[in-house]
Amino acid sequence: QKLSKHKTPAQPQLKAANCCEEVKELKAQVANLSSLLSELNKKQERDWVSVVMQVMELESNSKRMESRLTDAESKYSEMNNQIDIMQLQAAQTVTQTSADAIYDCSSLYQKNYRISGVYKLPPDDFLGSPELEVFCDMETSGGGWTIIQRRKSGLVSFYRDWKQYKQGFGSIRGDFWLGNEHIHRLSRQPTRLRVEMEDWEGNLRYAEYSHFVLGNELNSYRLFLGNYTGNVGNDALQYHNNTAFSTKDKDNDNCLDKCAQLRKGGYWYNCCTDSNLNGVYYRLGEHNKHLDGITWYGWHGSTYSLKRVEMKIRPEDFKP
């Protein structure tokens, strides 16, 4: 703001008074400017924090979107499965021998539920099993498969403790472990295991076992397998047969080293691995450098981490 120029000479007192007023005014303006500058600095800082938060939010959102995208693949078909499962539950009796009982995805298949997706298995008081949400594969090799493990997005850590592996974790439409207690219950009848794998070049392979049993917790969820068939090269689960389950906090392996800590997962570690299907999910570029990845020795060796894996079970006597 410019100082006013007087054409006529003013009286000295008036001049001094005007001067003082102008100085005051200038001081006030400087104070205002300082305040404004301080406010601007604060705003800039707030904006910067906000931008950082937004970037973090965007990163988080993109991860969420990636998860949603992978889920979306099966969403449409799953909507069909939401046809009131209460009808299904009402039809079920609590007797173990009942032909109407729903134990797993094969039971659902026999009741003409032929769409792959998420179903709720009703509780069974006789077997002492709670209600359980499962993902059913109703298409592969005749269908009726209950998926017990899936690795496809890498958004879920599998370096978990004994309790988490016992109860299960992850997202039923994404990456998950169904839970050792549930898998043990599901394998109490003669059961078949199928392991499906995909590498980073898009090749698909499978391994099937004529017999699959998971012992109870007292037996440390020990793995028992029957004969192998498949196209994945060497059988990389046989080495883990008759081996107890180990996690980072429960060392049940046959090794002086703690395999669960070395291989970063929960698994039937021997000393240590021919396969490590619950290992670390490594993305393309990092997928062939690590011993603790999702490995299957008989196919790509001990340092190649696979892109996708699913483990699924169904009764041995299942007929499509």
């Epitope: 060392d251 046959n254 090794c255 002086l256 080293d257 691995t273 021919d274 490590n276």
Partner: antibody, heavy 125, light 107 residues
Framework: EVQLVESGGGLVQPGGSLRLSCAAS????????MSWVRQAPGKGLEWVSA????????YYADSVKGRFTISRDNSKNTLYLQMNSLRAEDTAVYYC??????????????????WGKGTTVTVSS | DIQMTQSPSSVSASVGDRVTITCRAS??????LAWYQQKPGKAPKLLIY???SLQSGVPSRFSGSGSGTDFTLTISSLQPEDFATYYC?????????FGQGTKVDIK
Amino acid sequence: EVQLVESGGGLVQPGGSLRLSCAASGFTFSSYAMSWVRQAPGKGLEWVSAISGSGGSTYYADSVKGRFTISRDNSKNTLYLQMNSLRAEDTAVYYCAKVERDMVRGHYYYYMDVWGKGTTVTVSS
Amino acid sequence: DIQMTQSPSSVSASVGDRVTITCRASQGISSWLAWYQQKPGKAPKLLIYAASSLQSGVPSRFSGSGSGTDFTLTISSLQPEDFATYYCQQANSFPWTFGQGTKVDIK
């Protein structure tokens, strides 16, 4: 040069206790698992116990389980075998051994590559 | 526990002979087998590990083979210093176990 020297052997009465030590030198002690093996007079070798490098994992032969305790002090480069409730059949030369590890296709292979000269334990009344 | 059975329990041989010692496991142990040599009053010495890998410093006349349940230690041309007792040992699972030993003495 890698060296293992056992000590602490001697004559002890049945039911008594003894603590064997094994002083290690010439290698990074904490990086290796260690083991105890014994040999009764005129008999073959019998594995007794093993311990991981950190001391977190220990294993025992059924014949000594509950009576013997393997431990290590990595700051002193020393392996120990605490032997309680000793029996006549525990009479033997006790060897300590360094356990080497090799990895093939994701499997770890263990073997005892360096042995001490042994210390004699006699359990007799 | 895995039992290890060696045969023969003793063998008489001459310098220059080819000597073969076998070791059988009561169940499959993959390649988790080591061979040791022991001379009277001395500590055992590692010869072979992982069924067929020769330990550093061990003469090449010693060789190991086998996998699963049946294993062999071969001395291609016996030398005077080779007269000793030989033990196989499995490290497939705990407890680790030794064979009962095979004594190689002079014919």
